[in-house]
Interface confidence: low
Amino acid sequence: NIDVCKLGTVTVQPAPVIPLGSAANISCSLNPKQGCSHYPSSNELILLKFVNDVLVENLHGKKVHDHTGHSSTFQVTNLSLGMTLFVCKLNCSNSQKKPPVPVCGVEISVGVAPEPPQNISCVQEGENGTVACSWNSGKVTYLKTNYTLQLSGPNNLTCQKQCFSDNRQNCNRLDLGINLSPDLAESRFIVRVTAINDLGNSSSLPHTFTFLDIVIPLPPWDIRINFLNASGSRGTLQWEDEGQVVLNQLRYQPLNSTSWNMVNATNAKGKYDLRDLRPFTEYEFQISSKLHLSGGSWSNWSESLRTRTPEEEPVGILDIWYMKQDIDYDRQQISLFWKSLNPSEARGKILHYQVTLQEVTKKTTLQNTTRHTSWTRVIPRTGAWTASVSAANSKGASAPTHINIVDLCGTGLLAPHQVSAKSENMDNILVTWQPPKKADSAVREYIVEWRALQPGSITKFPPHWLRIPPDNMSALISENIKPYICYEIRVHALSESQGGCSSIRGDSKHKAPVSGPHITAITEKKERLFISWTHIPFPEQRGCILHYRIYWKERDSTAQPELCEIQYRRSQNSHPISSLQPRVTYVLWMTAVTAAGESPQGNEREFCPQGKAN
C-alpha cells in the first residue's frame, strides 16, 4: 500500500542479499512513456545511496552501462554489513530548476552465512513443565536467519519448532511445548539446531540428554514452621514438593545476618527438624529440591518464609549502677540504674524488671517492679544495703544481679591516681588512671562514669558508665559523647565493701568559647575588690573551660591591661583582686579559656575603688 515505483523499476544482480565483500549491479529502468519529455536523450538517471535514512553518496560515476534516457546500470562495491537503500532518480537536464524525481529503489542486505549453533542447553521446569532449549547463535549475520530446533527420542518421538533472528529480535531459545515424564527417566533424547539464511545454512552438533539431566524441579511451596512446645530454639520446618524429589537443601538465617546456615536433607518428605534456632529472632527460611542424589539440577530457591521464633526466659546478667545522695541526718536517696539486655540475652520482649533493696543485718526488704531502667527509693543512712535486679519476659525472669551499696567516694585510700582524659576523635574520650596507692582491700572492679556538665543533668539524665576489670587502667568512652560538650568523668575503684573515686573533666572536641563570663557586680571589702560573674551559658562553652581571666586597665589608658587567671570551678562565681589604685577609674572584663583558645571578652564594667591601696 506504499505509492512507489510508478515511473520505473530497479533491479539488482546477482541478488538483493549478498555476502560481505561482494559487488552488485543495480539497474534502473523507466517505464514506457515515462520520462522528462518527448526527447529521451534529456532523461538522466542517477543513483543515490542512503544509510540509516541519510544520503551518503551519489553513484553518478559508477555507471557501467547506459541506454540513454531509458535505463542505466551502476556497480556498487564495499557495502557495509546490514541494509543499504539505493534510490534511482530522474534528472531532467533541460530543466535545471526542478529537483530530481524519485523513480524507484531497492534495499541491498549485506551479511554472512550463519555459524553452527553451539552450547545447546535444555531444561524442563517441573515434572509437568515443557522442554525449552537455548543456544549460542555465534556471530551476528545481519540477515533474517531462521532457526529450527529438532528433538528426537525413543518410540519414534520427534518434535520441532522454529523462530527467526533479524535486526529487531534475536532467536536463541525455543520452547518445544512437550512434556517429558519421569517414566522416561533412563531414556536418551537428542536435540539439534539448524540455522538458515539467504547466504547459507549450518547445523549444531547433536546434543544428548536424559530426563534427569534437564528436569529442574519446581521450587518447594507452602513453607511453614511449627515450634515444639512453643520452644524458641527448636522447630519443624514443613513444605510441599513435587513427588519425585529425593534431596532438599535448606538455608536459614536471622534477618540481619549476612551468612546462611545450610542443611542437606535426604528423603525429608517435606519435613525437617531444626534445633539450633535463636529465641525471639526474625528468621528467613528457604528450600531447594533435587530429583536425584547424584545427577540432575537443584530447583530455584523457594520463596522465603519469614517468621519470628517464640520467646524463652531471659539469660545474662544486668549491668547495674547506682547513685547515693544524703537527704538529711538519717536518710539517703538511692537511685538504681541498669542497662537493657541485648536481644540474645533478653530472648523476648522485656515486660518489667524486679527490683529488690535489702538491709543485710536487719533483713529489711523493699521490692518493686518497674518497666523503666531506673528506680529510686529513700532508705535509712544506717546499715549495709544490697540491691538486686532481674528482667522478666513472657516466659520467665533472668537470674537476679546483685550489687553492694557502698559509699562510692568514701575511702580516699581507694581513690584512683593520675586520672587523665584525652580526646581521641569527635565522639570518644580516652580515660586513663593509675591504681589506688594504699588500698587496704583489693579492687574488685573499676567503674568509669560520665555525664554532661549542664544544668540539671544530675536530675534529668541518668549517668553513663562502663565496668572495667581490676587489671585494666583505661577506658574509651563513646556512648552519648558529643563534640564541644564538657563531661564530668569519675573513675570509681570498688572493693567488696568500700569505694573510692577521682574526678576529671574532659571533652571529645573543643573550640574557644563563644563569649566571656558576664560581670554582675564589683564590690569593695577591706581594701580588696570582689568581682562577681555569671557563668557562660552551657551551649556557648564549646568544651571544658580550663580557666577564667579577669582583665583591668585604667579607663583612658592605652597601656596593655593587667590580668589575673583563675582555675575554673563550677561552684565559684566571684574572686578578689587587690592591686588597684584608689580613686582611679578602671575598666574590667572577663574571658574564658578552653584547650582550643580564649573567648571574646564579656561585658565591660567600670569601677573606681575608694579605699586605701595595698
Epitope: 500500500n1 506504499i2 505509492d3 512507489v4 515505483c5 530497479v10 542512503f50 540509516n52 535514512d53 541519510v54 541494509m83 537503500l85 534510490v87 524507484c104 529503489g105 531497492v106 534495499e107 529487531r168
Partner: nanobody, 119 residues
C-alpha cells in the same frame, strides 16, 4: 538517525478514552513518505497490528478495534495519532508506533507507551 516517539498512554477506566501520538524526528525526508501503523503487545502475547494508514491515505483496522479506534496523520507535524474510545480491559498493552519507508520495506519502531484499562 530517524526516531519515533510515542506519548499519551496512561491509566483509564473501562469506557474511557485516550489519544496516542507518535512524532517522527531526526534525519527524515518527511513522514508523508511513510506508511504508518500502531501495534500493541500485551504481556506474554504476540505483537498485533491495531491500525494502519498508507502514504496515500488508505486506512485499515484490526477487527477488535473497528468502530472504537481512529487513526489519523498530520504530515506537517510529522505525526500520527490513534484516538481510542470505549476502551476495554482487554485493550491493556504497550502500544508501539511503526513507520515503513523506502523500497521494498524499511521499518522504524518507537519505544512504546503503556495503556492500562481498569475495570
Amino acid at each position: 538517525q530517524v526516531q519515533l516517539q510515542e506519548s499519551g498512554g496512561g491509566l483509564v477506566q473501562a469506557g474511557g478514552s485516550l489519544r496516542l501520538s507518535c512524532a517522527a524526528s531526526g534525519s527524515i525526508r518527511s513522514i508523508n513518505a511513510m506508511a504508518m501503523a500502531w501495534y500493541r503487545q500485551a504481556p506474554g502475547k504476540q505483537r498485533e497490528l491495531v491500525a494502519s494508514i498508507s502514504n496515500s491515505g488508505s486506512i485499515g483496522y484490526a477487527d477488535s478495534v473497528k468502530g472504537r479506534f481512529t487513526i489519523s496523520r498530520d504530515n506537517g507535524k510529522n505525526s500520527v495519532y490513534l484516538q481510542m474510545n470505549s476502551l476495554k480491559p482487554e485493550d491493556t498493552a504497550v502500544y508501539l508506533c511503526n513507520g515503513r519507508t523506502g523500497w521494498p520495506r524499511y521499518d522504524l519502531w518507537g519505544q512504546g507507551t503503556q495503556v492500562t484499562v481498569s475495570s
